[in-house]
Interface confidence: medium
């Protein structure tokens, strides 16, 4: 839980955050775990600690190893570990799997590719973007803030996309690159006003007090990949996150495609250890996209 993998390329900047979070006012000490040697905080050093961040400016292959961060409050010390690996630059264009960040997928309607880890760095727009090592040129490609938008995505837009930016530290500039795969869903899609498949409006579900129960909100939005389509639950008109009841949890929406090509999303509301007071709540299944909002209400009753 409190160990995190980080990686980078030699001669580039790498910034790592301590996986053990604390209040921003807390002191954070960093150590190289193998030697228990303290990481200096003076910025003149190539590797230095800056609060919750560990900075390699630039990184070297020999920096690889496990780094310990100790977050110190006035009365408590809590420990986290950053497992850092610095790789040699590849002579050819090929980016090996171990340097790849998570894959993202897109379609004609939604083709944002975010530059990984960029929020840790002091960078200025615009980003440079490369696909399979070739600089992206042309009006189809728009570098916007920390992401790339591709207009009229086609299947051959799939590939490995690398963002390159400059990190500035006290007037000195350091290059950073990060690569992730982009896959394209090949479909001619369209979007509709949301259609809620379940629950039926004003449905009542019978539950056993003390048992667990799941409510599924399922809605369809059209065909193909959908832009800004969400399915969520509300309790008495409030977001689940605003309703401080740990027994009631909403799962992240799961995308579902049917044989007829409909793009649907299911969001499950899990209620653990059903209580009498849960029967008094109004459960709203909300489906929202650019066309509008549809709401179905369900209530619970005792079996």
């Amino acid at each position: 839980k409190f160990s995190k993998q980080s990686w980078g390329l030699e001669n580039e900047a790498l910034i790592v955050r301590c996986p053990r979070q604390g209040k921003s006012s807390y002191i954070v000490d960093w150590y190289y775990s193998q030697t228990n040697k303290s990481i200096p905080t003076q910025e003149r050093n190539r590797v230095f600690a800056s609060g919750q961040l560990l900075k390699f400016l630039p990184a070297e292959v020999a920096d690889s190893g496990i780094y310990t961060c100790i977050v110190r409050s006035p009365t408590f010390n809590r420990t986290g570990y950053a497992n850092v690996t610095i790789y040699k630059k590849q002579p050819d264009c090929n980016v090996p799997d171990y340097l790849m960040y998570s894959t993202v997928s897109g379609s004609e309607k939604n083709s944002k590719i975010y530059c990984p880890t960029i929020d840790l760095y002091n960078w200025t727009a615009p980003l440079e973007w490369f696909k399979n090592c070739q600089a992206l040129q042309g009006s189809r490609y728009k570098a916007h803030k920390s992401f790339l938008v591709i207009d009229n995505v086609m299947t051959d837009d799939a590939g490995d996309y690398t963002c390159k930016f400059i990190h500035n530290e006290n007037g000195a500039n350091y290059s950073v690159t990060a690569t992730r795969s982009f896959t394209v869903k090949d479909e001619q899609g369209f979007s509709l006003f949301p259609v809620i498949r379940a629950p039926a409006h004003n449905e009542t579900k019978e539950v056993e007090i003390g048992e667990n129960t799941n409510l599924t909100c399922s809605a369809c939005f059209g065909k193909g990949a959908q832009f800004l389509a969400t399915v969520q639950w509300q309790l008495n008109g409030n977001k689940i996150t605003d309703f401080s009841e740990p027994r009631i949890q909403q799962e992240e929406g799961q995308n579902q495609s049917f044989s007829n090509g409909l793009a649907c999303v299911n969001t499950v509301l899990r209620i653990a250890d059903v209580k009498e007071e849960d029967l008094l709540l109004r459960y709203d299944c909300l489906a929202l996209n650019l066309h509008g909002l549809r709401r179905h209400t369900i209530r619970l009753s005792r079996k």
Partner: antibody, heavy 123, light 107 residues
Framework: EVQLLESGGGLVQPGGSLRLSCAAS????????MFWVRQAPGKGLEWVSA????????YYADSVKGRFTISRDNSKNTLYLQMNSLRAEDTAVYYC????????????????WGQGTLVTVSS | EIVLTQSPATLSLSPGERATLSCRAS??????LAWYQQKPGQAPRLLIY???NRATGIPARFSGSGSGTDFTLTISSLEPEDFAVYYC?????????FGQGTKVEIK
């Protein structure tokens, strides 16, 4: 020196109400999440309620939800627990305690506790 | 909610002996586990946090170990003032929960 001092306990009939207070000193009260924990006579510890430093987020155990309300007045360095519809099973020593770390609703340990105030619910 | 089960319920030992107290969680709590000591008529006192770290001012004879679901509090050599009830507490998720306690009594 950190100090927490509970008050407001006493004998109350079932269905009655009581308001507990906890006066804090020796630390920046508004920077800390605060808790109420209770202990029935001869029994173990049971978490009752928690409130974030700024007072916006509150949390309750199932056994008291809808009956108890936690609040705080940061200008007075005081934590409160309003207890309504009291039952015999609410009889316990009520402790207020400080969470020295919690960030955004993730709890930690309780490093300072008051000496407790006894609430007895009986007819 | 996460249930913490402490064993044994009572431990009868003499001063100078080693005490080993166990706390088992119904699901993994990583290292988000604390130990408290409580003497009669007093409030609980924090001993250990993050499974193995001693709180400020706690003597070195107290040590904690374990992660996931199985945890141990060890008192290497019991002092007269160590005879008390010990509770474990998890804080990985709401609601925080306590074990039912282990009483360490003089044999």
């Amino acid at each position: 020196e950190v100090q927490l001092l509970e008050s407001g306990g006493g004998l109350v009939q079932p269905g009655g109400s009581l308001r507990l207070s906890c006066a804090a000193s020796g630390f920046t009260f508004s920077s800390y999440d605060m808790f109420w924990v209770r202990q029935a006579p001869g029994k173990g510890l049971e978490w009752v309620s928690a409130i974030a430093g700024e007072g916006g987020r509150t949390y309750y155990a199932d056994s008291v939800k809808g009956r108890f309300t936690i609040s705080r007045d940061n200008s007075k360095n005081t934590l409160y627990l309003q207890m309504n519809s009291l039952r015999a099973e609410d009889t316990a020593v009520y402790y207020c305690a400080r969470d020295p770390w919690s960030t955004e609703g993730s709890f930690f340990v309780l490093d300072y506790w008051g000496q407790g105030t006894l609430v007895t619910v009986s007819s | 909610e996460i249930v913490l089960t402490q064993s044994p319920a009572t431990l009868s030992l003499s001063p100078g002996e080693r005490a080993t107290l166990s706390c088992r969680a119904s699901q993994s709590v990583d290292d988000d586990l604390a130990w408290y000591q409580q003497k009669p008529g007093q409030a609980p006192r924090l001993l250990i946090y993050d499974a193995s770290n001693r709180a400020t001012g706690i003597p070195a004879r107290f040590s904690g170990s374990g992660s996931g679901t199985d945890f141990t509090l060890t008192i290497s050599s019991l002092e007269p003032e160590d005879f008390a009830v010990y509770y474990c507490q998890q804080y990985i998720g709401a609601p925080i929960t306590f074990g039912q306690g282990t009483k360490v009594e003089i044999k």
